[in-house]
């Protein structure tokens, strides 16, 4: 049913939902912090623009009781009920922050009217792309997936000279929420990725995964999996691995390969790195420290949603344009506004845009070197380390087929 | 009313250090991000440094391991402190704060300090 917005005559507010299942465990203190000093910093953008209107957000807790479980596998049904319990208490904002687990956004997109922006830090799944009022501001899945076929196809630089068509995939179930949704989408037939691939096999067993490590009739050097140097270390221990192999670890939400006294430990040798592109410092936040690298990009994009609803509430109030319209709802999208920590591009369907970095370990430092960059806003790839000291014959990476000549 | 007020530019030898100053208005300081640009005679006026809100800072090619921007939250003030000055660092530094406008530059500008590297 139509909830009416307190979104008019000069107060905004923002209806923020403080999900007990969350894509990352933080506490929703935290949360509440990041979204409070955003408040601050978007009262002062306003007031500098001679724009004398209040901002606030309101904090919509769910009780609890039955969507206990602290992950997204509850997540359903907990967004629901909290929609429910805007829509009885007529407390509905200009914009709704919160879901952040793939199947609560998808299902509260599904089941409300299209007349408001949902923000979302997270909602990785391939099923909330392409929603016209959703906004995600961390790497959604499709970004992971482009980059990798464009990697996959690229065979012009001078430490890879083939293209590949193949891969394995390791997905055991126990991922955290991120990951879950970018294997799920390297993992779904129909995605773009699989679609590009000429083989593609998922292991699920630890078993699996270890034995493709030194079995000769494998098909395919490439692995892809997704976590920190710690999670591949469990599985793979000091094993022996076959000199073609190739490891592709998917680790977006973690600079810790950037620290200067970091040494790369000896199992990383065969794995390239994916993370994103580093500098989510948050240096002087209140609400940042003691918090992990990951839960730092959570807590910014929270703080990023509050200064993107200021970024839109400016420019509308500038035209002088209404706010609970259809246009405010759709407006969410293509543009660049600043954020947190730098400036932040959404792409045409409100999807975040990034550098990724692919990183190697040198032979030569035991350091994480960047090998490339890739540009999600334009899909394009660019190569950094032309001679890199690879662990990999000739400094080149393997062909994705053994025996199998140059294409 | 914005104010940006640079200062610390003076006359220094080659290897020498400078801190520059820019004290803000709080109302823009809390909010924005901001830059310092320097303009050498005859040059076209470049971005030297840029700090955001989160303390995160990045660099033009030229100053890189020798410039350091930061930031004091309760002065509302942005240092550029230089080290390893040589000649060609000679400009007036400016400091910008604000929102973004449409030529890809603040909306605020200081009225500059000059540095002069020079035995």
């Known amino acids: 049913s139509q909830v009416s917005q307190n979104c008019h005559n000069g107060s905004y507010e923002i209806s923020v939902l403080m999900m007990g299942n969350s894509a990352f465990a933080e506490p929703l203190k935290n949360l509440e912090d990041a979204v409070n000093e955003g408040l601050e910093i978007v009262r002062g953008r306003l007031q500098n623009a001679g724009l004398n209107v209040t901002v606030n957000a309101t904090f919509m807790y769910s009780d609890g009781l039955i969507h206990n479980s602290g992950d997204c596998r509850s997540s359903t049904c907990e967004g629901l009920d909290l929609l429910r319990k805007i829509s009885n208490a007529q407390r509905m904002g200009c914009v709704l922050i919160g879901p952040s687990c793939t199947y609560s956004t998808f299902q509260m997109y599904l089941d409300t009217e299209l007349s408001y922006p949902m923000i979302s830090a997270g909602s990785f799944g391939l099923s909330c792309d392409y929603k016209e009022t959703l906004t995600r501001l961390m790497s959604p899945a499709r970004k992971l997936m482009y980059f990798l076929v464009n990697f996959w196809k690229t065979n012009d630089l001078p430490f890879k000279t083939y293209s590949w068509s193949t891969s394995y995939v390791y997905k055991n179930g126990t991922e955290t929420e991120d990951c879950f949704w970018y294997l799920n989408a390297l993992e779904a037939s129909v995605s773009y990725f699989s679609h590009e691939l000429g083989f593609k096999v998922v292991l699920r067993q630890d078993k699996e995964f270890q034995d493709i490590l030194m079995d000769h009739n494998r098909k395919s050097n490439v692995i892809i999996m997704c976590g920190g140097p710690e999670f591949l270390y469990k599985l793979k221990g000091d094993r022996a691995v076959a000199e073609d192999i190739v490891i592709i670890l998917v680790d977006l939400f973690n600079d810790q390969y950037f620290e200067d006294n970091v040494t790369a430990p000896d199992y990383m040798k065969n794995v390239l790195v994916l993370t994103l592109s580093p500098g989510n410092s948050l240096l002087n936040s209140s609400f940042s420290r003691n918090l992990s690298p990951t839960k730092r990009d959570f807590a910014l994009a929270y703080l990023n949603g509050i200064l993107l609803f200021g970024h839109m509430l400016k420019i509308f109030l500038e035209n002088g344009e209404n706010i609970t319209t259809p246009k405010f709802a759709h407006a969410f999208r293509n543009l660049t506004f600043e954020g947190y920590d730098g400036p932040v591009t959404l792409d045409d369907w409100g999807d975040v845009d990034s550098t990724m970095v692919l990183l190697y370990t040198s032979v030569d430092t035991k350091k994480y070197k960047v090998l490339l960059t890739y540009d999600t806003h334009v899909n394009k790839t660019y190569p950094v380390d032309m001679s890199p000291t690879f662990t990999w014959k000739n400094s080149k990476l393997p062909n994705d087929i053994t025996g199998r000549g140059p294409q | 009313q914005v104010q940006l007020v640079e200062s610390g530019g003076g006359l220094v030898q080659p290897g020498g250090s400078l801190r520059l100053s820019c004290a803000a208005s709080?109302?823009?300081?809390?909010?924005?991000?901001m830059d310092w640009y320097r303009q050498a005679p005859g040059k076209q006026r470049e971005m030297v440094a840029t700090?955001?809100?989160?303390?995160?800072?990045t660099y033009t090619d030229a100053v890189k391991g020798r410039f350091t921007i930061s930031r004091d939250n309760a002065k509302n003030t942005v240092y550029l402190q230089m080290n390893n000055l040589k000649p060609e660092d000679t400009a007036v530094y400016y400091c910008?704060?604000?929102?973004?406008?449409?030529?890809?530059?603040?909306?605020?500008w200081g009225q500059g300090t000059q540095v002069t590297v020079s035995s």
């Open positions: 700090i955001w809100l989160s303390g995160r800072s």
């Open positions: 910008n704060a604000g929102p973004t406008t449409a030529s890809s530059v603040r909306q605020y």
């Open positions: 709080s109302n823009i300081f809390r909010a924005y991000g």
